[in-house]
C-alpha cells in the first residue's frame, strides 16, 4: 500500500448482505461439573447451560456435549471467562524449605477441532501461576479473539483443574462466540 | 441436526437488513468518583466519562446517571475493564499471626436492570482474591460478553470498593456495549 | 427523548449497507522478539506473525513494522493479550529488609498513532504489580474495547518488558482488531 | 425506608385530566423503573404505564396511550401520572410502583372518583 | 396483548389445605409474578420470575411453570392468607394480570 491512497471502501463489496439478526450466537453459562474421565497431559473439558437464566443459542449455534457447533464458516468472536477457587498453593512453603519451588498454575484454552485436522486447534490459552499467601483464593482468567472457522467445527473450554472451577454463578464463568 | 448437514445460509435471513453505523454503540471512560450512598449489601455503581476523549456514546445509546440505557432490543456486546489500586491488604501479617485468613477481595460485576424483572440482574462478575506481599498493589479486572436485551434496560458497572478504583486514565477504567 | 418512546429503530438507517464478509479484520500472534532500539520513557512495540498458523489480515486491513494499518474510517473492536513470564520480583525481600517498596509491574499499552495528533494516543492499558512469592511466575494481561478509528490511523502494543513476554505460543500472546 | 406516596384531587369532573403524583422516598428512583396501575371499583388491576426516570424512556398501555403521560421530577423525587378526558370508568385506586429493584414497592393508593 | 386467564375466580379451603391457582397465557412469557391483596390495601409481591419467593414471604408460597402455564401454591392455608391472588406477566406491552383468585376460609 506505499505510496498508494486506500480504496473507496464502497467498490469493496464482495459478499452476499446479510441480516445481523440472523447469525450464529450463542453464550454459555457453568454449571457443576460431574467428573468425566479425560486422557493424561489432556485437559478436561467443562460442560455448560445453553438455555436457562443467560445462557442460550440461536441461529443453528448448537451446543452438545460439551462443544459449540459451528454451522456456518465465517469469523467468529470468540470469548470465555473462568473463576478459579482454591486453598493456597503451598509455594510459599515450598521456598521457605529450600527446595525447588515450582508454582502452581490455573490454566483455561479455547480449543477447536476440526474435520479438516486431526489434532485439535488451541485458540486461546490464559495461564497464571498461582502461589498465593491467604488461604483461600479465587480469580477469573479472561479469553476473547476473532478466528476463522469453517462449517462443522466444535469449539470446546478446557481447563487445568476443574475442581478449581467455581461453578457457583452463571456470571463468573461462561463461554460464548458469534459471528461476526 | 444429527445425520443432517447444516442448512445453507442464504435461506436463513429471517430479519431485516440494517446498516452497521446506526447500530447503539457507547465506549465510557472512568472519571474521579464522587461519594453516593448506596444500600447495604449492593455494589456501589461507577459513574462514567461518556463524550470527551476517547468516550462517545452514538445511535440513541444514551448514558444518564450511572446507566447505560439501551434503545432497542437485540444482542449487545459488554465490557468492561475496572483498574484498582490499594495498600496491601493484611492477609500475610493476619496469617502469620495464625488467625484464620479471609482474604480481601476486589470484584466488578455488570448489572442489568430491567422492567421486566423486579430485580437487578448480574450479567458479568470478575472477582479476584487480594493478598499481596508488596506494599502497594495495583491490577485490571476485565470482564466482557454477549446479552439479550431489551428496549429499555438499563447497564451499570458496580464495584466492591469504590475507593480502590484507579481513575487517573481513561485507558485504565472504561465500559462499553454494542448492538452486533 | 424527554417523555417519549425510543424512535423505531427501521426509521434509523443512514449509512448504506455492507456486507459483512469484507470487512477489515486481522488476527495477529506473538513471534519471537528481536531487541530493537527505544526511546527512554517509551514503551517497546511488539512486533507480530499476520499470516501463518491463526493469524490473518484481511479485507485491506494490512500489517507492517509492528503498526496494522486502518484501511476505513469507522468503530473498530481492538483486543490483545499478553503473557508474561519471569522470575521474582525482590518486593517481599525489600520489604523484609525494611526498605521502601516499589513493587515490580507489567504493563500493556494498546496504542493508537494518527497523522491528525502529533502524540500517540494511549487507548487501553492494562498494569499490574507483581510481587510474587514462587520463584518463575507467569500471568496474561487482556485488554478489549471499541474505539473510532480514522482511514490510516495504526495500532501498536506496546509492554514495558518486552524480555518478559511469552512468545512461545500463539495462543498466549495475541493483537486483534475488526471493524463493527 | 423505601416509600412511595400517591397524593392529587380525590374528585374530577368528566373530561378534565386527573392529575396524581407519587413522592419517591428511600432510594435513588433512577436505579429503577416507576410505573402506574389502577384497580376499579370491584375489578382487576390494570397496568397504565411506566417511566424509567434515569432517561424519561415511557411506555405506555396501547388501550390508555392516546390520554396517558408519564412524567417525572428528579429535583423533586417524583413522579408524575396525567390522564386526559376521564369519564366515571376512570373511578379507580391508583397505585404507584416500583420495579427493577427488589422488593418491588407499592404506595397505598390514591382513590380518584370522576364524577360531576 | 398477552391474555393472563387465572383459575379458578374464587375457592373456599379449610386451614391448612393446601391451595393451588394457575395461570394461563395467551402466549409463552419467561416471568411470571404473584400478588397478594388483602381488603383496602395495596398488592403485594409474593413471586417473581415465576418461582422466586420474594424476600419475607412465608415459604409455605410457592410458584412453578414456565412458558404459558403456571402455578402458584400455598401448601398450608393460614387464616392470614385470607386474600385476592394475582398472577403477572411483566414481557409484553401492556403489562398484564390475571383477574384475581378470591380465597376464603371454610
Known amino acids: 500500500l506505499k505510496g498508494q491512497e486506500f480504496a473507496p471502501s464502497h467498490q469493496q463489496v464482495y459478499a452476499p448482505l446479510r441480516a445481523d439478526g440472523d447469525k450464529p450466537r450463542a453464550h454459555l453459562t457453568v454449571v457443576r461439573q460431574t467428573p468425566t474421565q479425560h486422557f493424561k497431559n489432556q485437559f478436561p473439558a467443562l460442560h455448560w447451560e445453553h438455555e436457562l437464566g443467560l445462557a442460550f443459542t440461536k441461529n443453528r449455534m448448537n451446543y452438545t456435549n460439551k462443544f459449540l457447533l459451528i454451522p456456518e464458516s465465517g469469523d467468529y468472536f470468540i470469548y470465555s471467562q473462568v473463576t478459579f477457587r482454591g486453598m493456597t498453593s503451598e509455594c510459599s512453603e515450598i521456598r521457605q524449605a529450600g527446595r525447588p519451588n515450582k508454582p502452581d498454575s490455573i490454566t483455561v484454552v479455547i480449543t477447536k477441532v476440526t474435520d479438516s485436522y486431526p489434532e485439535p486447534t488451541q485458540l486461546l490459552m490464559g495461564t497464571k501461576s498461582v502461589c498465593e499467601v491467604g488461604s483461600n483464593w479465587f480469580q477469573p482468567i479472561y479469553l476473547g479473539a476473532m478466528f476463522s472457522l469453517q462449517e462443522g467445527d466444535k469449539l470446546m473450554v478446557n481447563v487445568s483443574d476443574i475442581s478449581l472451577v467455581d461453578y457457583t454463578k452463571e456470571d463468573k464463568t461462561f463461554f460464548g462466540a458469534f459471528l461476526l | 441436526l444429527k445425520g443432517q448437514e447444516f442448512a445453507p445460509s442464504h435461506q436463513q435471513v429471517y430479519a431485516p437488513l440494517r446498516a452497521d453505523g446506526d447500530k447503539p454503540r457507547a465506549h465510557l471512560t472512568v472519571v474521579r468518583q464522587t461519594p453516593t450512598q448506596h444500600f447495604k449489601n449492593q455494589f456501589p455503581a461507577l459513574h462514567w466519562e461518556h463524550e470527551l476523549g476517547l468516550a462517545f456514546t452514538k445511535n440513541r445509546m444514551n448514558y444518564t446517571n450511572k446507566f447505560l440505557l439501551i434503545p432497542e432490543s437485540g444482542d449487545y456486546f459488554i465490557y468492561s475493564q475496572v483498574t484498582f489500586r490499594g495498600m496491601t491488604s493484611e492477609c500475610s501479617e493476619i496469617r502469620q499471626a495464625g488467625r484464620p485468613n479471609k482474604p480481601d477481595s476486589i470484584t466488578v460485576v455488570i448489572t442489568k436492570v430491567t422492567d421486566s424483572y423486579p430485580e437487578p440482574t448480574q450479567l458479568l462478575m470478575g472477582t479476584k482474591s487480594v493478598c499481596e506481599v508488596g506494599s502497594n498493589w495495583f491490577q485490571p479486572i476485565y470482564l466482557g460478553a454477549m446479552f439479550s436485551l431489551q428496549e429499555g434496560d438499563k447497564l451499570m458497572v458496580n464495584v466492591s470498593d469504590i475507593s480502590l478504583v484507579d481513575y487517573t486514565k481513561e485507558d485504565k477504567t472504561f465500559f462499553g456495549a454494542f448492538l452486533l | 427523548l424527554k417523555g417519549q418512546e425510543f424512535a423505531p429503530s427501521h426509521q434509523q438507517v443512514y449509512a448504506p449497507l455492507r456486507a459483512d464478509g469484507d470487512k477489515p479484520r486481522a488476527h495477529l500472534t506473538v513471534v519471537r522478539q528481536t531487541p530493537t532500539q527505544h526511546f527512554k520513557n517509551q514503551f517497546p512495540a511488539l512486533h507480530w506473525e499476520h499470516e501463518l498458523g491463526l493469524a490473518f489480515t484481511k479485507n485491506r486491513m494490512n500489517y507492517t513494522n509492528k503498526f496494522l494499518l486502518i484501511p476505513e474510517s469507522g468503530d473498530y473492536f481492538i483486543y490483545s493479550q499478553v503473557t508474561f513470564r519471569g522470575m521474582t520480583s525482590e518486593c517481599s525481600e525489600i520489604r523484609q529488609a525494611g526498605r521502601p517498596n516499589k513493587p515490580d509491574s507489567i504493563t500493556v499499552v494498546i496504542t493508537k498513532v494518527t497523522d491528525s495528533y502529533p502524540e500517540p494516543t494511549q487507548l487501553l492499558m492494562g498494569t499490574k504489580s507483581v510481587c510474587e512469592v514462587g520463584s518463575n511466575w507467569f500471568q496474561p494481561i487482556y485488554l478489549g474495547a471499541m474505539f473510532s478509528l480514522q482511514e490510516g490511523d495504526k495500532l501498536m502494543v506496546n509492554v514495558s518488558d518486552i524480555s518478559l513476554v511469552d512468545y512461545t505460543k500463539e495462543d498466549k500472546t495475541f493483537f486483534g482488531a475488526f471493524l463493527l | 425506608q423505601v416509600q412511595l406516596q400517591e397524593s392529587g384531587p380525590g374528585l374530577v369532573r368528566p373530561s378534565q385530566t386527573l392529575s396524581l403524583t407519587c413522592t419517591v422516598s428511600g432510594f435513588d428512583f433512577q436505579d429503577t423503573y416507576m410505573h402506574w396501575v389502577r384497580q376499579r371499583p370491584g375489578r382487576g388491576l390494570e397496568w397504565m404505564g411506566r417511566i424509567d426516570p434515569a432517561s424519561e424512556h415511557t411506555k405506555y398501555n396501547p388501550s390508555l396511550k392516546s390520554r396517558v403521560t408519564i412524567t417525572r421530577d428528579t429535583s423533586k423525587n417524583q413522579v408524575s401520572l396525567r390522564l386526559s378526558s376521564v369519564t366515571a370508568a376512570d373511578t379507580a385506586v391508583y397505585y404507584c410502583?416500583?420495579?427493577?429493584?427488589?422488593?418491588?414497592?407499592w404506595g397505598q393508593g390514591s382513590l380518584v372518583t370522576v364524577s360531576s | 396483548d398477552i391474555q393472563m386467564t387465572q383459575s379458578p375466580s374464587s375457592l373456599s379451603a379449610s386451614v391448612g389445605d393446601r391451595v393451588t391457582i394457575t395461570c394461563r397465557a395467551s402466549q409463552g412469557v419467561r416471568y411470571m409474578y404473584w400478588y397478594q391483596q388483602k381488603p383496602g390495601k395495596a398488592p403485594k409481591l409474593l413471586i417473581y420470575?415465576?418461582?422466586n419467593l420474594a424476600s419475607g414471604v412465608p415459604s409455605r408460597f410457592s410458584g412453578s411453570g414456565s412458558g404459558t402455564d403456571f402455578t402458584f401454591t400455598i401448601s398450608s392455608l393460614q387464616p392470614e392468607d385470607i386474600a385476592t391472588y394475582y398472577c403477572q406477566q411483566w414481557e409484553g406491552n401492556p403489562r398484564t394480570f390475571g383477574q384475581g383468585t378470591k380465597v376464603e376460609i371454610k
Open positions: 410502583v416500583r420495579s427493577g429493584g427488589l422488593p418491588d414497592v
Open positions: 420470575g415465576a418461582s
